[in-house]
């Protein structure tokens, strides 16, 4: 007996569907109608045949009452080849739902997305997360997707993007976007970051995550942020192989005074990088390769400093006296 493709938990809160059969019974997903969190994994299937079975151009208002009744707030769709027309049809219908968070992962979007009809209403998402999603339209995908969303998006996460740079002239501003996560795009680099941070399109960014994005120096990131006019309060540069020293010929970069939290953990640093902001609320330098204690002008003024997991603090290294530089905490680095 093959296992049921969909499983709903006892609280009717979370429903997960794994459609791995070549000819899946999609109607099984109806048991998820009462769930708040829904995950649908299509086992890498090509959903092109679906277009023949549904009328992607039908007026979605006919489903409005039914869709409004759904409890779903968080939806994850993964592992499929999806025609853009089908994606658009789904977005048009979901616009009538109470969906707040949408995650698309391991998807290949084929074809181009049609423009939003005048009478259509956008999807009022607060969070959109994309991981390993490829788009046939190349750099213009964000602009195409954006027109199907209302302007209230607060969180945007784009990981393993095939084209992390956007066609900036086509992208409209994200006035409410406070968190942008471009982590896990190792090919991005500082030049790519400049291209991805479309100037003045992200005016409200407070949290910017750039883990594992091929960043090289904090100063280079500073320059990219300054060029884009992006002034985050919190910046995560962890899991990049960062250089501590600055190219002497490179111009000095003044960090925005808005920045108060900087994560430089797991960055392979052998010394505290030069050119950090003068004052920070939080600085995380844990799990680096600092082999000596910093001297007073090497650290900014920090309220909350994390240094655990650096060689100079590890118990067993010779310290001048007990308690001197040892936090007593040894994190798993």
């Amino acid at each position: 007996t093959t296992p049921e493709p969909c499983e709903l938990d006892d609280e009717d809160f979370r429903c997960v569907c794994n459609f791995s059969e070549p000819q899946p019974d999609w109607s099984e997903a109806f048991q998820c109608v009462s769930a708040v969190e829904v995950e649908i994994h299509a086992g890498g299937l090509n959903l092109e045949p679906f277009l023949k079975r549904v009328d992607a151009d039908a007026d979605p208002r006919q489903y409005a009452d039914t869709v409004k009744a759904l409890r779903v707030r968080r939806l994850t769709v993964g592992a499929a080849q999806v025609p853009a027309q089908l994606l658009v049809g789904a977005l048009r219908v979901l616009a009538y739902s109470r969906l707040k968070e949408l995650t698309l992962e391991d998807l290949k979007i084929t074809g181009t997305m049609p423009p939003l009809p005048l009478e259509a209403t956008g999807l009022a998402l607060s969070s959109l997360r994309l991981r390993n999603v490829s788009w046939a339209t190349g750099r213009s995908w964000l602009a195409e997707l954006q027109q199907w969303l209302k302007p209230g998006l607060k969180v945007l996460s784009i990981a393993q993007a095939h084209s992390p740079a956007f066609s900036c002239e086509q992208v409209r501003a994200f006035p409410a976007l406070t968190s942008l996560d471009l982590s896990d795009n190792p090919g991005l680099g500082e030049r790519g970051l400049m291209a991805a941070l479309c100037p003045h399109k992200f005016p409200a960014i407070q949290n910017l995550a750039l883990r594992n994005t091929g960043m090289e120096t904090p100063t280079g990131v500073c320059a990219a942020l300054a060029a884009a006019g992006v002034q985050p309060h919190s910046l995560d540069l962890s899991h990049n192989s960062l250089r501590a020293t600055v190219n002497p010929s490179a111009p000095r970069c003044m960090w925005s005074s808005a920045l108060n939290s900087l994560n430089l953990s797991f960055a392979g640093l052998e010394q505290v990088p030069k050119g950090l902001p003068a004052k920070l609320r939080v600085l995380d330098l844990s799990c680096n390769r600092l082999n000596r204690a910093p001297q007073p002008d090497e650290l900014p003024e920090v309220d909350n400093l994390t240094l655990d997991g650096n060689p100079f603090l590890v118990p067993g290294t010779a310290l001048p006296h007990e308690g001197s530089m040892n936090s007593g905490v040894v994190p798993a680095c």
Epitope: R292, Q295, D297, E301, L305, P320, S327, G328, V329
Partner: antibody, heavy 125, light 108 residues
Framework: QVQLVQSGHEVKQPGASVKVSCKAS????????MNWVKQAPGQGLEWMGW????????TYADDFKQRFVFSMDTSASTAYLQISSLKAEDMAMYYC??????????????????WGQGTMVTVSS | EIVMTQSPATLSVSPGERATLSCKAS??????VDWYQQKPGQAPRLLIY???NRYTGIPARFSGSGSGTEFTLTISSLQSEDFAVYYC??????????FGQGTKVEIK
Amino acid sequence: QVQLVQSGHEVKQPGASVKVSCKASGYSFTDYAMNWVKQAPGQGLEWMGWINTQTGKPTYADDFKQRFVFSMDTSASTAYLQISSLKAEDMAMYYCARSTFYYSSYIYGWYFDFWGQGTMVTVSS
Amino acid sequence: EIVMTQSPATLSVSPGERATLSCKASQNVGSNVDWYQQKPGQAPRLLIYKASNRYTGIPARFSGSGSGTEFTLTISSLQSEDFAVYYCMQSNTNPPWTFGQGTKVEIK
């Protein structure tokens, strides 16, 4: 064991210069910043500033930005304090003191764990 | 610049008695206050670092407390070798650092 040994007492005329040395031993000289502290006769301690022993960059307290120079010789594990155009108010005991870094769950700072024995600089005509 | 004010200027105590020395910072310095002891003709010696941590080899009768702007050094039972001048110093993360003017502990 860690030791900071300073040069001997000096008697100088007003307007002259003096160079006080502080030789470190028992630890890696470049791993710890070196501070200078002044103590005028019968007075309290006054922090003059410090030198980054990695880079050689000095930092001076406001009252010591003129006529005072901190320097170092890494190969000799020695820090120096030079005072030029000596004045009567420069007459004091000068101490070098090593800064050690402290860190414990988010809190950090430095303190002076080892001090030189002091060098008395007398300014007299 | 942060000003450190110590009180009293002189404290007269009998051997075996408790001595309490006060140090006030002109602004919040967290726990970044260290205490030093200086005997005549000697260099200062570190007693307490970061407000309450006793330095290696310092007897348990010395203890430090406080945070923010008010700090205290307590000597629970004065020994003859404890009669000296005591200085607090703020080492608030980044320089400039400043010493208090000192408290002289003398035999009553």
